[in-house]
Interface confidence: low
């Protein structure tokens, strides 16, 4: 709204950089063949690139990534009782970001 | 724990708390009647609740919010030349979070 500019501070651009995000650990990352289990923890923190660049043709992208294996609990229900196993999920952390030109494919004429 | 799955460390739950997120300032927040302008900055940081709670019937929600007006530039194109105006956008920051029971409406029978 254009109205009162009284207490409004200048908006500061959210620069292109890594920020902490929440990653949901979906069950099919662990076992695609079986739905009869739970995963603990259900979500973890990851580092991801986000923010804006100076113009629309440029996007904030990861310039350096690192794969990080973490151990989760796979809680299977066997004969109505929980059975606990360990599983590894590989998370992707972004270590560095850059504003990268987005190449939009030209329409074929 | 550590050795059992090579270098995999135990996954740590992303707790329900405020984290910095990027909010895209869409043009219709400023002027729904006109599309012939740009906004600067195109995005800003906000504080938002995210993370997981202990079970599926509970969700991470904001328990305290604060509205924060910020001043943006509305760059109109008038006769092919940029004209700079100021506008206010009100952002919502989450100040505190809690794990809140999700009441799923019962199907009407």
């Amino acid at each position: 709204s254009l109205g009162s500019l009284a207490a409004a501070e200048p908006a500061v651009i959210a620069e292109c950089k890594t920020r902490t995000e929440v990653f949901q650990i979906s069950r099919n990352l662990i076992d695609r063949t079986n739905a009869n289990f739970l995963v603990w923890p259900p979500c973890v923190e990851v580092q991801r690139c986000s923010g804006c660049c100076n113009n629309r043709n440029v996007q904030c992208r990861a310039s350096q990534v690192q794969m990080r294996p973490v151990q989760v609990r796979k809680i299977e229900i066997v004969r109505k009782k929980p059975v606990f196993k360990k599983a590894t999920v590989t998370l992707e952390d972004h270590l560095a970001c850059k504003c990268e030109t987005v190449v939009t494919p030209r329409p074929v004429t | 724990s550590l050795g059992s799955l090579a270098a995999a460390e135990p996954a740590v739950i992303a707790e329900c708390k405020t984290r910095t997120e990027v909010f895209q300032i869409s043009r219709n927040l400023i002027d729904r009647t006109n599309a012939n302008f740009l906004v600067w900055p195109p995005c800003v940081e906000v504080q938002r609740c995210s993370g997981c709670c202990n079970n599926r019937n509970v969700q991470c929600r904001a328990s305290q919010v604060q509205m924060r007006p910020v001043q943006v530039r509305k760059i109109e194109i008038v006769r092919k030349k940029p004209v700079f105006k100021k506008a206010t956008v009100t952002l919502e920051d989450h100040l505190a979070c809690k794990c809140e029971t999700v009441v799923t409406p019962r199907p009407v029978t």
Epitope: K81, P82, F84, K85 | S1, L2, S4, E9, P10, V12
Partner: antibody
């Protein structure tokens, strides 16, 4: 390489106090629950205390509750056990161990132990 | 509290023998059961976690089985370096408890 090194053991009189330390290296200490386990001479293993990764949660068996306090300093990669009101039956080798992502895990890294002798 | 009872408390065996140690929990602990090996003057070493999962670096002659209240540690062919004391431990609930140990001696 993961290493846990205990220190601070020694001879102490009944009713006395002692502070044990465990220096950790080779892993992200702040991500792990840590545990103290003790072993009296010629006896089996006994769980003594556990502390969460951030240090906010602690667990003890009744045998040491209100006498022993586990703490940690993640900035120093160190685990501690404060032993108060010591009794002869507290004489044991005290081991620190890494407990994984929660208390309900296995202990797959152990220190070499430090001997506490309670005697007059 | 959950009591862990190991049997036998000691056994004598020869190199090449198949050795079985049992551990019984006073109530169901699902598969929250770990096995450790300890040699004199040394810290315990994790062999098996979650009842049947072999810890990395542990020889495949060691295996674990069981669920609920009854668990078994088996050494398929005893080697000279396996003479030690073995402990089971439940991590199902606090207080965390260990079995009394089984000493495996040379016959």
């Amino acid at each position: 390489e993961v290493q846990l090194v205990e220190s601070g053991g020694g001879l102490v009189q009944p009713g006395g106090s002692l502070r044990l330390s465990c220096a950790a290296s080779g892993f992200t200490f702040s991500s792990f629950w840590m545990t103290w386990v003790r072993q009296a001479p010629g006896k089996g293993l006994e769980w003594v205390a556990s502390i969460s990764a951030g240090g906010g949660i602690t667990h003890y068996p009744d045998s040491v509750k209100d006498r022993f306090t586990v703490s940690r300093d993640n900035a120093k990669n160190s685990l501690y056990l404060q032993l108060n009101s010591l009794r002869a039956e507290d004489t044991a080798v005290y081991y620190c161990a890494e407990s994984g992502g929660d208390i309900y895990s296995d202990f797959d890294y152990w220190g070499q132990g430090t001997l506490v002798t309670v005697s007059s | 509290d959950i009591q862990m009872t190991q049997s036998p408390s000691s056994l004598s065996a020869s190199v090449g023998d198949r050795v079985t140690i049992t551990c019984r929990a006073s109530q169901s602990i699902s598969n929250y059961l770990n096995w450790y090996q300890q040699k004199p003057g040394k810290a315990p070493k994790l062999l098996i976690y979650a009842a049947s999962s072999l810890q990395s670096g542990v020889p495949s002659r060691f295996s674990g089985s069981g669920s609920g209240t009854d668990f078994t540690l088996t050494i398929s062919s005893l080697q000279p370096e396996d003479f030690a004391t073995y402990y089971c431990q439940q991590s199902y609930s606090t207080p965390l408890t260990f079995g009394g140990g089984t000493k495996v001696e040379i016959k």
